[in-house]
């Protein structure tokens, strides 16, 4: 993560403080909120990004139907606990000693409890369904062109290996992107689907985490693809454990 000595920044994460105090005067960047050193040649973990965000000043369908175990992040923002590698700790608690278990993307997967709540392991989110609605266009996008553009986006911008983009579904105006990545499939150095999905979510909301060019320029055969709504479903390797009270 090098840069000009007088202007040292992190291209992949705006929410950092950088200084040329690394080995040989190289640029070293630390995430806001946690102070953890980040690798600016790849995506920063969602946990560190959420922590940084909380520390920053406030300002016959082809479509997939998520199954009953799919989680949506309804709890919104919170200040998470991250492990030394930047992953979410399995158990998260707030300042009032209310605790809950989360999955690898930091979404709550149990009822809330007290400090006695046990979360034995961090359960991996292995399937993410990104549900988008695009703004009206003159006609529907060509499905194969749309598929190619979105796969290219995830490969180029987020450096997600193409094998983890399982499918792109389209039924105007709804687009669904399926990301799949089992624990056994994820090799060292592979971008996590949860981190890629989070960066994408921030990009389509116009809140890019990247320095430089910033916002997305999504185009299908020259036609702008503008997203007006995003909903993300998370499926875990082990189904979540909620009481019936929550489900009714």
């Amino acid at each position: 993560h090098t840069a000009a000595q007088d202007n040292c920044t992190c291209p992949t994460n705006k929410m950092t403080v950088c200084s040329p105090d690394g080995p040989g005067g190289r640029c070293q960047c630390r995430a806001l909120g946690s102070g953890v050193a980040v690798d600016c040649s790849t995506l920063t973990s969602k946990c560190l990004l959420l922590k940084a965000r909380m520390s920053a000043p406030k300002n016959a369908r082809t479509l997939v139907r998520p199954n009953e175990h799919a989680l949506v992040d309804n709890d919104g923002l919170y200040d998470p606990d991250c492990d030394p590698e930047g992953r979410f700790k399995a158990r998260q608690c707030n300042q009032t000693s209310v605790c809950w278990c989360v999955n690898s993307v930091g979404v709550r997967r149990t009822d809330k409890g007290d400090l006695s709540l046990r979360c034995d392991e961090l359960v991996r989110t292995h399937h993410i369904l990104i549900d988008l609605r695009h703004r009206p266009t003159a006609g529907a996008f060509n499905h194969s062109d749309l598929d190619a553009e979105l796969r290219r986006l995830f490969r180029e911008r987020y450096r997600l290996h193409p094998k983890f983009v399982a499918a792109v579904h389209y039924e105007q105006p709804t687009i669904q992107i399926e990301l799949r990545q089992n624990t056994s499939q994820k090799a060292a150095g592979d971008v996590d689907i949860g981190d890629a999905a989070y960066y994408f979510e921030r990009d389509v909301k116009g809140e890019s985490l990247f320095q430089g060019r910033g916002g997305l320029d999504l185009r299908v055969r020259g036609e702008p693809l503008q997203v007006e709504r995003t909903l993300i479903y998370y499926l875990d390797e082990i189904p979540p454990k909620f009481s019936m009270k929550r489900l009714t």
Epitope: T2, A3, N7, T9, C10, G212, R213, D217
Partner: antibody
Framework: AVTLDESGGGLQTPGGGLSLVCKAS????????MFWVRQAPGKGLEWVAV????????NYAPAVKGRATISRDNGQSTLRLQLNNLRAEDTGTYYC???????????????????WGHGTEVIVSS | ALALTQPSSVSANPGETVKITCSGG???YGWFQQKSPGIAPVIVI????NRPSDIPSRFSGSKSGSTGTLTITGVQAEDEAVYFC???????????FGAGTTLTVL
């Protein structure tokens, strides 16, 4: 075959302006970022400017910022570089180049150049 | 502006393996071969490790951390040229090049 053909070079006077044109063929021009790169006589390569595929984003090297304008016409598959207030140090061969990674966070990188033109020579002299 | 760092010259006997390094960038690297000034450079590697189809397989690229490496396995006399690396300066969001490495085949 993918080709990039530059034109518009030649002898220029200091303080004047020039307009270089690059005609692209053999690929879907609208799908690629485009660059200008130059090389002064006996010197190394210098990144000059980049434009994204829609033309909504441009970026310039400090040496030409404020004097250069990069633009494109996707319908005609042409790239342009307008350079004003010419100086002797603008002398060199100007190359049009194609970028292979339009979505990348570091898409301005010279490391993505996957096709060069043959170049057009510019001499700034009185 | 920031320039990428590469050795000014390297030499090798025919058949030997040559490695040229490039550091100082914060993104992807490319490698360009120029046999004489004013003649358009030839792309030998782009995006760290992608080799164009018309480039011999003896040329390969890799990246470790913020250092890119061009490897020529079994160098040949016709590989004698100046090799420029190209990359990205994250502080200015601009492209940059190294000053060039002259490869001499003995």
């Amino acid at each position: 075959a993918v080709t990039l053909d530059e034109s518009g070079g030649g002898l220029q006077t200091p303080g004047g302006g020039l307009s270089l044109v690059c005609k692209a063929s053999g690929f879907d021009f609208i799908d690629y970022d485009m660059f200008w790169v130059r090389q002064a006589p006996g010197k190394g390569l210098e990144w000059v400017a980049v434009i994204n595929r829609s033309g909504s984003y441009t970026n310039y090297a400090p040496a030409v910022k404020g004097r250069a304008t990069i633009s494109r016409d996707n319908g005609q598959s042409t790239l342009r570089l307008q350079l004003n207030n010419l100086r002797a140090e603008d002398t060199g061969t100007y190359y049009c180049a194609r970028g292979a990674c339009t979505h990348c966070w570091d898409a301005d990188s010279a490391g993505y150049i996957d096709t060069w033109g043959h170049g057009t020579e510019v001499i700034v002299s009185s | 502006a920031l320039a990428l760092t590469q050795p000014s010259s390297v030499s090798a006997n025919p058949g030997e393996t040559v490695k040229i390094t490039c550091s100082g960038g914060s993104g992807s690297y490319g490698w360009f071969q120029q046999k004489s000034p004013g003649i358009a450079p030839v792309i030998v590697i782009f995006n760290d490790d992608n080799r164009p189809s018309d480039i011999p397989s003896r040329f390969s690229g890799s990246k470790s951390g913020s250092t890119g490496t061009l490897t020529i396995t079994g160098v040949q006399a016709e590989d004698e040229a100046v090799y420029f690396c190209g990359g990205y300066d994250g502080s200015t969001d601009a492209g940059i090049f190294g000053a060039g490495t002259t490869l001499t085949v003995l």
